[in-house]
């Protein structure tokens, strides 16, 4: 297993609709034809997998059916969007990139993106 550098933004603020997007960029040492991207969430020293996708020559990442993630790729950049976030989902979201093929296998883990989610205030009742 060889190490690889992965860069991602330090902080992202989710939209009022609970959507957060960020770019995960990896320094590929060669021309990988099969790449696996995993988003991990670290909160209270616990790490859980949020979503994962394996992609090849296309620019659309395909996630499992119940995934809250969507994404596209362009070169060595992956544009990730996480949906359905609530305040309790605030945490550090880590991008993990694996170059699956061809050998050798490379693994890179980013420093994480702190995603802040603020639940929208309920609209006050209006007389109008």
């Amino acid at each position: 297993c060889k190490a690889m550098h992965v860069a991602q933004p330090a902080v992202v603020l989710a939209s009022s609709r609970g959507i957060a997007s960020f770019v995960c960029e990896y320094a590929s040492p060669g021309k990988a034809t099969e790449v696996r991207v995993t988003v991990l969430r670290q909160a209270d020293s616990q790490v859980t997998e949020v979503c994962a996708a394996t992609y090849m020559m296309g620019n659309e990442l395909t996630f499992l059916d119940d995934s809250i993630c969507t994404g596209t790729s362009s070169g060595n950049q992956v544009n990730l969007t996480i949906q359905g976030l609530r305040a309790m989902d605030t945490g550090l979201y880590i991008c993990k990139v694996e170059l699956m093929y061809p050998p050798p296998y490379y693994l890179g883990i980013g420093n994480g993106t702190q995603i802040y989610v603020i639940d929208p205030e309920p609209c006050p009742d209006s007389d109008f």
Epitope: E34, T54, G58, N59, L64, D65, S67, M100, Y101
Partner: antibody
Amino acid sequence: QVHLQQSGDVLVKPGASVNLSCKASGYTFTSYWINWIKQRPGQGLEWIGRIAPGSGTTYYNEMFTGKATLTVVTSSTTAYIHLSSLSFEDSAVYFCARGDYFDYWDQGTTLTVSS
Amino acid sequence: QIVLTQSPAIMSASPGGKVTITCSASKSVSYIHWFQQKPGTSPKLLIYDTSTLASGVPARFSGSGSGPSYSLTISRVEAEDAATYYCQQRTTYPLTFGGGTKLEVR
């Protein structure tokens, strides 16, 4: 040029198993998914699953779990689908298609399950 | 799984006319892709990533849309466009196709 060539049409009895092949040429085999698609007579398209030829990574439509198994032999740039415990409902045309974009398809193999 | 609903299921058009086929997804998808299938042949990639024409596809075909609602338009229908058209999503597994729209050119 890119070409996908499938095995010939097949007639089998219920309960039997079958292997269909998809021979790829004209491109780097390990750089693209191979997808398998089922089409029953007069019906639409159903995605069965896909395999990454380099690593062997597979994704399946749950509807075909236990029915279909995807494999590849990279040395011969050939992908295979193994269909088991065949029933009349498995009678269909089976296609293989290349990559994320399904940009090249083979001509299709007609599988007929009949007693 | 994401269900793609195409409408209409069958339609008829005259040469030179304009037709629009719609594809509605049960939940938002990143892109929609379109295929054309003529009787007895394999499907052919027509449009990918919602609006990009595949190689060799005539400019009279176009695609548009976002979120859950997409469409395929043929601006000037020709006799050779008689076929069944399928939309497809690749945002989540399993990959799914719409039920198809059969276009008859009279």
